[in-house]
Interface confidence: low
């Protein structure tokens, strides 16, 4: 429905608090280097303008699109050229090209300092001093570091962040109360950001059809009692929401997400029996809860799929009349019967089915041609099952840290051109699949593991896209969204790679390693491991293990020494020499 003033419409729908928060997120996701104060100023100006439009929708400029209003505001930033370089050229363009230009300049790995958590008392003072500014800073710092973070979900995180400080800053032991909550929010936030990044990549790199297919499969698993038409309606609405958020239309996205939650709760009887608790919560919690809700029970006595999709004489007729609807029905029916499959596996099966029908419906005897299509599914199902079984066994044998190290070696050998920080980050995250998924029973392992791996490999893809260095990574990332993981799994050692020259400086360590947290110390050691493999890609597991064991012993010894720095200098030289000898460097 058309509104005279889009900005007034959204302000009224969302309310001032959410309006301001979402505009701040939008601006911080576009201009990631701008200081907080500059963004707050811009947001306040937009908010004051929106209020004039609420009072009089016919007032000057109130009829302009949100992209025009926001883009004009962003282009008033004085230091645009100095801070952002060619991004400033976006301002010479007209909408919609200007917004597209801003979107293209979003940086998944912005050059921003690591967020260091201050002392609890310092944070509590800041919170008590000016709660509103404190929470705005949270939104700003997360949004600028995660330019695709799902904005309405970030509002939910901010609400929990506020609740944590409200409760813990008056607790007897503030730190014991607050720090675990902040750790949980940080970890959940990173996971949420990465999941949303995959949705945006799916939409932007592979198109709406790819995203809709993903949504059909996931919602059919989650709501197996819902009719196909109901699932289709939810998929259409969900696609609109994510298209808007990924496109920077955060006000529309948040508004539409609220409408979708309202619709789901008003129609929960025809969607899922698991929604009752979610639907009793306030808006932000409700939307989050629906997004995370467990799968409903499968209806009893579902008929065999073969009748409609293999045995029927009308398969080719049905396919020809409405290809996407027919394939959508196939995906819906298959997914609702298989909560034990990953979404990407379901999409591979649907793709195989589509390819078979394309070929067979043009053949002399279509039925004879596609009669065995379900047999083609068997190896596709067994491949991830076997891979997960093997890797969970390895994880249980090694534990998370050493399992991560095994993956570091594996992936460095596959794609040694990728930067060391990216290999460490991605391999550490790949390794977390063990503790995240291997504890689950068989029926939940694959959807947990393979869909998580899709999210992590997408991180590799978006980081690599910024600075492409490996044709193999580009190939696996761009050829097929659903086959990314099998593509990376199939990569062998890159025989074309010329080993990196040995540089002793890379393996020189100092006493500061002793004061690092366990996690940071692991990252240091894993960075060294990647560099070792880059120097000696043909090193055996045994050789690498021996060097890493020596390295761990060296760190432990020097951290216990009275003169740590001297120990690191002298023992470090010996370690480098011994490692070179052991690896034949």
């Amino acid at each position: 429905d058309a509104h005279k003033s889009e900005v007034a419409h959204r302000f009224k729908d969302l309310g001032e608090e959410n309006f301001k928060a979402l505009v701040l997120i939008a601006f911080a996701q576009y201009l990631q280097q701008c200081p907080f104060e500059d963004h707050v100023k811009l947001v306040n100006e937009v908010t004051e303008f929106a209020k004039t439009c609420v009072a009089d929708e016919s007032a000057e400029n109130c009829d302009k699109s949100l992209h025009t209003l926001f883009g004009d505001k962003l282009c008033t930033v004085a230091t645009l050229r100095e801070t952002y370089g060619e991004m400033a050229d976006c301002c010479a363009k007209q909408e919609p090209e200007r917004n597209e230009c801003f979107l293209q300049h979003k940086d998944d790995n912005p050059n921003l300092p690591r967020l260091v958590r201050p002392e609890v008392d310092v944070m509590c003072t800041a919170f008590h001093d000016n709660e509103e500014t404190f929470l705005k800073k949270y939104l700003y710092e997360i949004a600028r570091r995660h330019p695709y973070f799902y904005a309405p979900e970030l509002l939910f995180f901010a609400k929990r962040y506020k609740a944590a400080f409200t409760e813990c800053c008056q607790a007897a032991d503030k730190a014991a109360c607050l720090l675990p909550k902040l750790d949980e929010l940080r970890d959940e936030g990173k996971a949420s950001s990465a999941k949303q990044r995959l949705k945006c990549a799916s939409l932007q790199k592979f198109g709406e059809r790819a995203f809709k297919a993903w949504a059909v499969a996931r919602l059919s698993q989650r709501f197996p009692k819902a009719e196909f038409a109901e699932v289709s309606k939810l998929v259409t609405d969900l696609t609109k929401v994510h298209t808007e958020c990924c496109h920077g239309d955060l006000l529309e996205c948040a508004d539409d997400r609220a409408d979708l939650a309202k619709y789901i709760c008003e129609n929960q009887d025809s969607i899922s029996s698991k929604l009752k608790e979610c639907c009793e919560k306030p808006l932000l919690e409700k939307s989050h809860c629906i997004a995370e809700v467990e799968n409903d029970e499968m209806p009893a006595d579902l008929p065999s799929l073969a009748a409609d999709f293999v045995e029927s004489k009308d398969v080719c007729k049905n396919y020809a009349e409405a290809k996407d609807v027919f394939l959508g029905m196939f995906l819906y029916e298959y997914a609702r019967r298989h909560p034990d499959y990953s979404v990407v596996l379901l999409l591979r099966l649907a793709k195989t089915y589509e390819t078979t029908l394309e070929k067979c419906c043009a053949a002399a005897d279509p039925h004879e041609c596609y009669a065995k299509v379900f047999d083609e599914f068997k190896p596709l199902v067994e491949e991830p099952q076997n891979l997960i079984k093997q890797n969970c066994e390895l994880f249980e044998q090694l534990g998370e840290y050493k399992f991560q190290n095994a993956l570091l070696v594996r992936y460095t050998k596959k794609v040694p051109q990728v930067s060391t920080p990216t290999l460490v980050e991605v391999s550490r995250n790949l390794g977390k699949v063990g503790s995240k998924c291997c504890k689950h029973p068989e029926a939940k392992r694959m959807p947990c593991a393979e869909d998580y791996l899709s999210v992590v490999l997408n991180q590799l893809c978006v980081l690599h896209e910024k600075t492409p260095v490996s044709d193999r990574v580009t190939k696996c990332c761009t050829e097929s969204l659903v086959n990314r993981r099998p593509c990376f799994s199939a990569l062998e050692v890159d025989e074309t790679y010329v080993p990196k020259e040995f540089n002793a400086e890379t393996f020189t360590f100092h006493a500061d390693i002793c004061t690092l947290s366990e996690k940071e110390r692991q990252i240091k050691k894993q960075t060294a491991l990647v560099e070792l493999v880059k120097h000696k890609p043909k090193a055996t597991k045994e050789q690498l293990k021996a060097v890493m064991d020596d390295f761990a012993a060296f760190v432990e010894k020097c951290c216990k020494a009275d003169d740590k720095e001297t120990c690191f200098a002298e023992e470090g030289k010996k370690l480098v020499a011994a490692s070179q000898a052991a690896l034949g460097l």
């Epitope: 104060e37 944070m123 003072t125 800041a126 001093d129 800073k137």
Partner: nanobody, 119 residues
Framework: EVQLLESGGGVVQPGGSLRLSCAAS????????MLWVRQAPGKGLEWVSV????????YYADSVKGRFTISRDNSKNTLYLQMNSLRAEDTAVYYC????????????WGQGTLVQVSS
């Protein structure tokens, strides 16, 4: 223009005491939380103590708890740090700063005053 001027530093023996002052101007002192930070030779910045605009609550780094006391006089726009039982590891340049700011760093600080604890 915001100005913060620290004073009261000097050389003191271990176990001795010093009182640092910080005169503030150019902003509304009584609506700003303030803090003391210090930088030991060759080390990074370390926060020492924070005081809310009203005078309470106050917070201290573990390393100075029970030995240092932060206070303020809003009528004089002045921040204080009473340092007792000084140790060699308290040797540093002490800065007063206005708090908070956009990046959980300190908005404005003074030139600092050197505290040297040695026998």
């Amino acid at each position: 223009e915001v100005q913060l001027l620290e004073s009261g530093g000097g050389v003191v023996q271990p176990g001795g005491s010093l009182r640092l002052s910080c005169a503030a101007s150019g902003f509304t002192f009584d609506t700003s939380s303030m803090l003391w930070v210090r930088q030991a030779p060759g080390k990074g910045l370390e926060w020492v103590s924070v005081i809310h605009q009203s005078g309470t609550p106050t917070y201290y780094a573990d390393s100075v708890k029970g030995r240092f006391t932060i206070s303020r006089d809003n009528s004089k726009n002045t921040l204080y740090l009473q340092m007792n039982s000084l140790r060699a590891e308290d040797t540093a340049v002490y800065y007063c700063a206005k708090f908070p700011s956009s990046r959980m760093k300190f908005d404005y600080w003074g030139q600092g005053t050197l505290v040297q604890v040695s026998s």
